[in-house]
Amino acid sequence: IWELKKDVYVVELDWYPDAPGEMVVLTCDTPEEDGITWTLDQSSEVLGSGKTLTIQVKEFGDAGQYTCHKGGEVLSHSLLLLHKKEDGIWSTDILKDQKEPKNKTFLRCEAKNYSGRFTCWWLTTISTDLTFSVKSSRGSSDPQGVTCGAATLSAERVRGDNKEYEYSVECQEDSACPAAEESLPIEVMVDAVHKLKYENYTSSFFIRDIIKPDPPKNLQLKPLKNSRQVEVSWEYPDTWSTPHSYFSLTFCVQVQGKSKREKKDRVFTDKTSATVICRKNASISVRAQDRYYSSSWSEWASVPCS
Amino acid sequence: RNLPVATPDPGMFPCLHHSQNLLRAVSNMLQKARQTLEFYPCTSEEIDHEDITKDKTSTVEACLPLELTKNESCLNSRETSFITNGSCLASRKTSFMMALCLSSIYEDLKMYQVEFKTMNAKLLMDPKRQIFLDQNMLAVIDELMQALNFNSETVPQKSSLEEPDFYKTKIKLCILLHAFRIRAVTIDRVMSYLNAS
């Protein structure tokens, strides 16, 4: 058993049929010695008396808020949560496996630049009685500070019969140099509590590996005389690291109709303009990627050909 | 420690092309190592990230773009002194800081060159003959060093009398390639910045 936060404790249980469970001793936070009784949740049934209560925790029915009283007055609470271990593996029931970039990916993180600011998100089908808390650091043995905000519900989607909820959190490394060469990864830890179930999820990454620039901005077209060709120009996104001559981007320019199966024109360039062939009912799209370290491409910025 | 804005004309900056070749060569070599050594811990997630130049050179700090010198997190206080007469310095106006930056890059290359050559000598003794260093990568390191053209004491190639542990050597190769790729990215960024300034 360990303390998650004040008056909240996590009991780690091997989860299998007829498992013996864990013996837990609760102590009432009071100077009083006599006349103390214990109850669980809303029940008025007295579970025991005395300053300490010993219980055998085997299942979710044994978890919950234990309260010690004296003469009708509440003295203190202890909330017990369960963390299940099945076949040596901690349960991952609360969050959905996003399967990208690999299986068992519960947390996904992205950074728009090298400033040390990043966003992580996760998915669940649970809508109520759910709380998250996020901690992060650079390295684990001698951790350096990363400050994370509160996790918030950022999107709701309908997937078949189920509703899917996306939560996200923003974090900022306390003293980040955009030009630094990372040798210790960022560690992100998410504590998830659903009713009386506790789970924790972690992700470890270098900022350089989770870079995904914003799409290029200010796309403009200029038709070329006596030609089917069009000059398309754009600018670096405002959120990208500066100076741009140091943090350079490379671009992919594509002309395509509405269907992915349609024919297309595609060209890669390090410049902020390119010449392509425009077709009726097609769009010109441009996306960006770090020129020197190939992490993710940005989303497309698009303008119609016409 | 930072790069001033007054730097050579773009046409006068021969190191940019060499640095691009360097990044390409080390990226290809790292990809080849990851494929060939697929049953060894050779991915970014699996290896320890070591920097053999730590406390010996200060390339990131010495080559910091002017715009980032206002960022206190970028101003590390590591002090290192370097020789300052390079041929990539195509303008007499080139500042002392830029010379310091380029000579720090030169020292990095020299250190990695020695490590890679020592390692290759060991790998050539491996009866499995599983992986060797790409001669193109070694040649590209050499070309960039020649373009930088700093006078510097030659570092003797390390020779080891004991029987090499090929498993450890291959893991060290992965660690070295990952670190060198990161440094090559920095070098490429620096050369691009100098070329544009």
């Epitope: 089917r228 360039t269 077709r279 | -």
Partner: antibody, heavy 118, light 107 residues
Framework: QVQLVQSGAEVKKPGSSVKVSCKAS????????LHWSRQAPGQGLEWMGW????????EYAPKFQGRVTITADESTSTAYMELSSLRSEDTAVYYC???????????WGQGTLVTVSS | DIVMTQSPLSLPVTPGEPASISCRAS??????LHWYQQKPGQAPRQLIA???QSISGVPSRFSGSGSGTDFTLTISSLQPEDFATYMC?????????FGQGTKVEIK
């Protein structure tokens, strides 16, 4: 299986014209750009131009502008390349090639030898 | 027009050995570079797209690298069927242009 089948070899006199055909099978004809290139004996490939069979749009290499005409007939899934004012240096194997991507080629025809000789 | 220069023009190689062919562009073309194989009397066959993207059905011994002006096609271990002429082609701008070809011959 996508295939491009070209017409047979031709011998032409200088100053005349030649029209080479390229019939596509497998896949929808108008879903692809169609290009023509040529290869003179012992030389590298030389790109001549492309057509979008869907709308008849064409683009030619400046070297051949005014001398080459590329057309397409959707009903027969056939593209044509006509080269006029032939000279001896036009002796080459002419290839058609196609792709959904405009600027490179994933399937090629077998080639048509055009010999220009007096 | 962008001029594509291949080297060497002829490359004698022992079967089973690796081979590398270089292609240089007269100006920067990013990764807009494609490789083809051509055997005598046959049409070219696509090997690599955009400098390094492998094509389905092409053996994994063929790989491409490079960007900007310098590109390389590598055959890790030459098989008897690989003796042919290899050509690069730039797609950075029209007119599309090809290298003059490198003939890989049996040593």
């Amino acid at each position: 299986q996508v295939q491009l089948v070209q017409s047979g070899a031709e011998v032409k006199k200088p100053g005349s014209s030649v029209k080479v055909s390229c019939k596509a099978s497998g896949g929808t004809f108008s879903d692809y750009y169609l290009h023509w290139s040529r290869q003179a004996p012992g030389q590298g490939l030389e790109w001549m131009g492309w057509i979008d069979p869907e709308n008849g749009d064409t683009e030619y290499a400046p070297k051949f502008q005014g001398r080459v005409t590329i057309t397409a007939d959707e009903s027969t899934s056939t593209a044509y390349m006509e080269l006029s004012s032939l000279r001896s240096e036009d002796t080459a194997v002419y290839y058609c090639a196609r792709n959904k991507e405009l600027r490179y080629f994933d399937v090629w025809g077998q080639g048509t030898l055009v010999t220009v000789s007096s | 027009d962008i001029v594509m220069t291949q080297s060497p023009l002829s490359l004698p190689v022992t079967p089973g050995e690796p081979a590398s062919i270089s292609c240089r562009a007269s100006q920067s073309i990013s990764i807009n570079l494609h490789w083809y194989q051509q055997k005598p009397g046959q049409a070219p066959r696509q090997l690599i797209a955009f400098a390094s993207q492998s094509i389905s059905g092409v053996p994994s011994r063929f790989s491409g690298s490079g960007s900007g002006t310098d590109f390389t096609l590598t055959i890790s271990s030459l098989q008897p069927e690989d003796f042919a002429t290899y050509m690069c082609q730039q797609s950075n701008s029209f007119p599309l242009t090809f290298g003059q070809g490198t003939k890989v011959e049996i040593k």
